[in-house]
């Protein structure tokens, strides 16, 4: 449905508050280095213009596309060239190339300071101006996470303000705020990673990849919904994610609201678990639907083999409508197996497709495909065995020890990858243990595999920016669903030429003593990566010795009266003992 003025249409649909929030997110995700006040100015300009268009849709410029209006605002920024370099060249292009150009300049790891919550300062800011506080949160998250799912960020901003509403009245602000902020931080990071994977799926593998992922996920959540209903939901959801990933945040939020309305209007045929969600206001409703628990599997479902292995018409059905038939296979398999990971279900569908491609070309297709379900079994066994081994190791070592084991494992596999990336990724991989190994058996596989997909996507996104390893490129680009098995199958890189020992990397100062525990761990883990890059064949025993020496050195100097002097004297000794231990 076309509107004379797209900006007026979206303003009316979304309302002023959401409109302004989404515009602020959009600008912050594109111009990640601009100060908050600069963005506020742009948002206010565009909002005033939108109001003009609401009053008179024929007003000059109101007919322009949102990309044109947004792009024109971005290109008005005075410091564009000096702050963003060649991003300024985007302004010489016409739409839609200009928007594509802006998108390509989004930075997944912008050089921005870590956000450190200070309860008193934050409460003062909150009390001074709640609206500004809300906007500042949107801005700070959006610029650090340029692909964050915009309507969901509005939800988190409201939650964030709610936390301050509650805690700034409390006796001990810090005790109330800090755990709540930390819990939210974890959720926000997970939400960011999920959306980054969705956007990467579309950008690198096409929307068919995201559709397949969504069919599996929604079929697990809504096993009572019919295949055609699930397909409709997937089509609409894919449109929403495509829009958000493409920077069309107003359309994305509007369409997401429509989808939530459709789901709630049709909850009788979708899921019995939606009642509570559908009673909530819009942002909470959409969030709740996205997080809703899986409905019970309908009773008396026929065996999968009936339609997909025993039926003599399998090849006819497949060849007449490949996507629909494979979609129904994925739907039927997924709704019967809520205990499987989405990525595993996608591997099953991929293998099923490969089997049909092979069998349907034969003289007796039925004889060939009738045993397909036996062929698929290994795809379920492999992750189950891997989860068992890794959870056993996690239980033995604890999170920090498990992270270190993963640092060793991954640095040996891909030593060319930058040290900060190896530390970040290995630390995240190690957290899988804490997140997933404690879960009941029925939830372990989806928890593990799907969380690993997020982390490996982060590795792929960071690596794509500065590619250094052919192995990483291969695992990242060959197959989205087989990324995890591809990385698991990597062996230590025998072609790697070890790095020369760099004393600077093992020189520490008194500032390490005052670092929070997490930061201390990162310092130690950074040293571990560097050791391995220098001596990839170091034994577990050698690494243990060196790391114990390092911990003793830090503990000793942090306990000394003159810490800096201690680090200056003991540091070179540590370097010598390290080189000796690794000789």
């Amino acid at each position: 449905d076309t509107h004379k003025s797209e900006i007026a249409h979206r303003f009316k649909d979304l309302g002023e508050e959401h409109f302004k929030g989404l515009v602020l997110i959009a600008f912050s995700q594109y111009l990640q280095q601009c100060p908050f006040d600069e963005h506020v100015k742009l948002v206010n300009e565009l909002t005033e213009f939108a109001k003009t268009c609401v009053a008179d849709e024929s007003h000059a410029g109101c007919e322009k596309s949102l990309h044109t209006l947004f792009g024109d605002e971005l290109c008005k920024v005075a410091s564009l060239r000096e702050t963003y370099g060649d991003m300024a060249d985007c302004c010489e292009k016409q739409e839609p190339e200009r928007n594509e150009c802006f998108l390509s300049h989004k930075d997944d790891s912008p050089d921005l300071p870590k956000l450190k919550p200070d309860p008193n300062t934050l409460c003062d800011e909150f009390k001074a101006d709640e609206k500004k506080f809300w906007g500042k949160y949107l801005y700070e998250i959006a610029r650090r996470h340029p692909y964050f799912y915009a309507p969901e960020l509005l939800y988190y901003a409201n939650k964030y303000n709610g936390v301050f509403q509650e805690c700034c009245q409390a006796e001990d602000k810090g005790a109330c705020l800090l755990p709540k902020i930390e819990t939210m931080r974890e959720k926000v990071l997970a939400s960011s990673a999920r959306q980054r994977l969705r956007c990467a799926s579309i950008q690198k593998f096409g929307e068919r990849a995201l559709k397949a992922w969504s069919v599996a996920r929604l079929s697990q959540k809504f096993p009572k919904a019919e295949f055609v209903e699930v397909t409709k939901l997937v089509t609409d959801l894919t449109k929403v994610h495509k829009e958000c990933c493409h920077g069309d945040l107003l359309e994305c939020a509007d369409d997401r609201a429509d989808l939530a309305k459709y789901i709630c209007d049709n909850q009788d045929t979708i899921s019995s678990k939606l009642k509570e969600c559908c009673d909530k206001p819009l942002l909470e409703k959409s969030h709740c639907i996205a997080e809703v628990e899986k409905d019970a599997i309908p009773e008396n479902l026929p065996p999968l083999t009936a339609d997909f292995a025993e039926d003599k018409d399998v090849c006819k059905n497949y060849q007449e409508a490949k996507d629909a038939f494979l979609g129904s296979f994925l739907y039927e398999y997924s709704r019967r197996h809520p205990e499987y990971a989405v990525s595993v279900l996608l591997r099953l569908a991929k293998e099923y497709e490969a089997t049909l491609e092979e069998c349907c070309a034969k003289d007796d297709p039925h004889a060939c495909y009738s045993t397909v379900f036996d062929k698929l079994k290994h795809l379920v066994d492999e992750p189950q065995n891997l989860i068992k081994q890794n959870c056993d190791q996690f239980e033995k070592l604890g999170e920090y020890g498990f992270q270190n084991a993963l640092i060793v494992r991954y640095t040996r596999k891909v030593p060319q990858v930058s040290t900060p990336t190896l530390v970040e990724v290995s630390r995240s991989l190690g957290k899988v243990g804490t997140r997933c190994c404690t879960k009941p058996e029925s939830e372990r596989m989806p928890c593990t595999e799907d969380y690993l997909s997020l982390i490996l996507n982060r590795l792929c996104v960071l690596h794509e920016k500065t590619p250094v390893s052919e192995k990483v490129t291969k695992c990242c680009t060959e197959s989205l669903v087989n990324r995890r098995p591809c990385f698991s199958a990597l062996t230590p890189d025998e072609t790697y030429v070890p790095k020369a020992f760099d004393e600077k990397l093992f020189t520490f100062h008194a500032d390490i003593c005052t670092l929070p525990d997490t930061e201390k761990q990162i310092k130690k883990q950074t040293a571990l990566v560097e050791l391995l890059k220098h001596k990839p064949k170091a034994t577990e025993e050698q690494l243990k010795t060196v790391m114990e020496n390092f911990v003793a050195f830090v503990d000793k100097c942090c306990a000394a009266d003159d810490k800096e002097a201690c680090f200056a004297v003991e540091g070179p000794k540590l370097v010598v003992s390290t080189q000796t231990a690794l000789a």
Epitope: V228, T235, N300, A306, D311, S328
Partner: antibody, heavy 122, light 108 residues
Framework: QVQLVQSGAEVKKPGSSVKVSCKAS????????ISWVRQAPGQGLEWMGG????????NYAQKFQGRVTITADESTSTAYMELSSLRSEDTAVYYC???????????????WGQGTLVTVSS | EIVLTQSPGTLSLSPGERATLSCRAS???????LAWYQQKPGQAPRLLIY???SRATGIPDRFSGSGSGTDFTLTISRLEPEDFAVYYC?????????FGQGTKVEIK
């Protein structure tokens, strides 16, 4: 409440084709599948085939393969059934019905059109 | 394909009586995927029962379905004047969909 409204009665010559339409309202056309069933005078019901409008994917009973074409237009929420090379034994009432999915083009039929009588006579 | 045979062909009963209609399949119907429809002259069929025993929306509770495998039954506990019609069973456990030839319930 889903409603399926079919086009009017047709009289056709043998060898010609007929195209029957079925317009859906109430509910969302893209979230269900449509089947076509026929009933010769004084006879039972016979399944001809079906379509998933959101995919544009059709499936036909062996008996009608090559002679029937089922299509759908999502923009108008309308399904169509075209039967070619008509003969006198194709004289029947043709019904469209919504399939409640039970498997690949299998299901029970919960809402029916009012039927379209097609008479094939020279 | 699965062939469905309905019996009897015609059932002559009085209002208030119990009607028992049978539908036998040539092979087992997967997951009891069997439906029953009622059709009155000049009208489209109307869904009564699906999944062998689940009543469709708005269907009075005097209609009940049972059975599994190859033998299925539709029971009308007390016939009302509006129940005199033709009844069809249909299986959707395997392709293609097939219908029985129908049972006519007439007033005695």
């Amino acid at each position: 409440q889903v409603q399926l409204v079919q086009s009017g009665a047709e009289v056709k010559k043998p060898g010609s084709s007929v195209k029957v339409s079925c317009k859906a309202s109430g509910g969302t056309f893209s979230s269900y599948a449509i089947s076509w069933v026929r009933q010769a005078p004084g006879q039972g019901l016979e399944w001809m085939g079906g379509i998933i409008p959101i995919f544009g994917t059709a499936n036909y009973a062996q008996k009608f393969q090559g002679r029937v074409t089922i299509t759908a237009d999502e923009s108008t929420s309308t399904a169509y059934m075209e039967l070619s090379s008509l003969r006198s034994e194709d004289t029947a009432v043709y019904y469209c019905a919504r399939i409640r999915w039970g498997g690949w083009f299998r299901g029970y039929l919960d809402y029916w059109g009012q039927g379209t009588l097609v008479t094939v006579s020279s | 394909e699965i062939v469905l045979t309905q019996s009897p062909g015609t059932l002559s009963l009085s209002p208030g009586e119990r009607a028992t209609l049978s539908c036998r399949a040539s092979q087992s119907v997967s997951s009891s995927y069997l439906a029953w429809y009622q059709q009155k002259p000049g009208q489209a069929p109307r869904l009564l029962i699906y999944g062998a025993s689940s009543r469709a929306t708005g269907i009075p509770d005097r209609f009940s379905g049972s059975g599994s495998g190859t033998d299925f039954t539709l029971t009308i506990s007390r016939l009302e004047p509006e129940d005199f019609a033709v009844y069809y069973c249909q299986q959707y456990g395997s392709s293609p969909l097939t219908f029985g030839q129908g049972t006519k319930v007439e007033i005695k």
